[in-house]
């Protein structure tokens, strides 16, 4: 019976699907073999002959079982602000991620398309939310009783030292200066070491040495159908 034919190509039964690692070829109207990762369809199947697969050429790849006529091109070499975390092989695309001190301003399916340097909070401002792989640092003004005297993408606002006798009062960008007697560090509730939520106002009004958003960049992305992958149906 046709339903029991084990070898591709074969005509599927009504309502049935082609098996795993097979696809339905619209021209042949048959279930045919897909090509394995690292290969592509060199010759499509007919009613009497199965798909002929061939290896991907250098700098091209297929990651899934497929029947694409050409392998996909690996992405371009990683830029100077990136590190290559996965090399281009016949079975996988190159993956570039942002190097330390940078975050991904424009991601792609795997890895990053555009990296941007992490914002540095200037003196008087501390890190409210640390940067991640995909988000920039958020700065906040140092609250009364705290300061930051650095330009840094990691330093938070620290509490002023508490003096027995104050020589120079502390402000948002400078620690208090004490006279002769030994200072003690404040552990007051206002002295916050961990990142806190910031108000919209403080985010909008904070001065920053760098732009707070990445420059607007346009990219031409493919709009055609995605390459055939697993799970195609039969007749």
């Amino acid at each position: 019976l046709p339903a029991q034919v084990a070898f591709t190509p074969y005509a599927p039964e009504p309502g049935s699907t082609c098996r795993l690692r097979e696809y339905y070829d619209q021209t042949a109207q048959m279930c045919c073999s897909k090509c394995s990762p690292g290969q592509h369809a060199k010759v499509f199947c007919t009613k009497t002959s199965d798909t002929v697969c061939d290896s991907c050429e250098d700098s091209t790849y297929t990651q899934l079982w497929n029947w694409v006529p050409e392998c996909l091109s690996c992405g371009s070499r990683c830029s100077s602000d990136q590190v290559e975390t996965q090399a281009c092989t016949r079975e996988q695309n190159r993956i570039c991620t942002c190097r330390p001190g940078w975050y991904c301003a424009l991601s792609k399916q795997e890895g990053c398309r555009l990296c941007a340097p992490l914002r540095k909070c200037r003196p008087g401002f501390g890190v409210a939310r640390p940067g991640t792989e995909t988000s920039d640092v958020v700065c906040k003004p140092c609250a009364p009783g705290t300061f930051s005297n650095t330009t840094s993408s990691t330093d938070i606002c620290r509490p002023h030292q508490i003096c027995n006798v104050v020589a120079i009062p502390g402000n948002a960008s400078m620690d208090a200066v004490c006279t002769s007697t030994s200072p003690t560090r404040s552990m007051a509730p206002g002295a916050v070491h961990l990142p806190q939520p910031v108000s919209t106002r403080s985010q909008h009004t904070q001065p920053t040495p760098e732009p707070s958003t990445a420059p607007s960049t346009s990219f031409l992305l493919p709009m055609g159908p995605s390459p055939p992958a697993e799970g195609s149906t039969g007749d």
Partner: antibody, heavy 115, light 111 residues
Framework: QVQLVQSGSELKKPGASVKVSCKAS????????MSWVRQAPGQGLEWMGW????????TYAQGFTGRFVFSLDTSVSTAYLQISSLKAEDTAVYFC????????WGQGTLVTVSS | DIVLTQSPDSLAVSLGERATINCRAS??????????MHWYQQKPGQPPKLLIY???NLESGVPDRFSGSGSRTDFTLTISSLQAEDVAVYYC?????????FGGGTKVEIK
């Protein structure tokens, strides 16, 4: 279940154009091609060609090139047949039929060309 | 193109009797162990309805009084016991190669 639902009857004047739609449901639209078949009044069935619903590439049978255009809108699982510069001899019922190794058919669309 | 020749053009059969329709292809319609010949029934104002696919497979929901046989170039549709609702035109169709082609049709009537 597989269903192909076509647009309603059309009455057109010679020289006009018509666009017939065929909406598919009950299966993945881009898996199977779509054929178009013509049946003139009191006549048999004539295959016009087909369109690959994955690639969008049409194939036209002899006698159906030029004035006949197959197209798709995969977002709504619909195939289209457009006929331009209509002639009286284009009067027929037009069927869409799923291109598997046998066909599932739409209900047909009557196109009448008359002055 | 593969030419399909149906015979007879019309057929009058008594209720309950056997009706046989033949379809001959100008070249083989067999590939990969299958015969890509199908049979359809068409009633006035309706689309063709699939009865038999790939020469001998009965489509789901079709009464088992319909059967198909044959291979390569010669095929037969048989209605074992004609019923009133079987009055229609019957077409063979091949999908082994493009262009799809159809037989000229056989009109089945009650005698």
């Amino acid at each position: 279940q597989v269903q192909l639902v076509q647009s309603g009857s059309e009455l057109k004047k010679p020289g006009a154009s018509v666009k017939v739609s065929c909406k598919a449901s009950g299966y993945t639209f881009t898996t199977f091609g779509m054929s178009w078949v013509r049946q003139a009044p009191g006549q048999g069935l004539e295959w016009m060609g087909w369109i690959n619903t994955y690639s969008g590439v049409p194939t036209y049978a002899q006698g159906f090139t030029g004035r006949f255009v197959f197209s798709l809108d995969t977002s709504v699982s619909t195939a289209y047949l457009q006929i331009s510069s209509l002639k009286a001899e284009d009067t027929a019922v037009y069927f869409c039929a799923r291109r598997s190794n046998f066909a599932y058919w739409g209900q047909g669309t009557l196109v009448t060309v008359s002055s | 193109d593969i030419v399909l020749t149906q015979s007879p053009d019309s057929l009058a059969v008594s209720l309950g009797e056997r009706a046989t329709i033949n379809c001959r292809a100008s070249e083989s319609v067999d590939s990969s162990g299958n015969s890509f010949m199908h049979w359809y029934q068409q009633k006035p104002g309706q689309p063709p309805k699939l009865l038999i696919y790939r020469a001998s497979n009965l489509e789901s929901g079709v009464p088992d009084r319909f059967s198909g046989s044959g291979s390569r170039t010669d095929f037969t549709l048989t209605i074992s016991s004609l019923q009133a609702e079987d009055v229609a035109v019957y077409y063979c169709q091949q999908s082994n190669e493009d262009p799809w082609t159809f037989g000229g049709g056989t009109k089945v009537e009650i005698k």
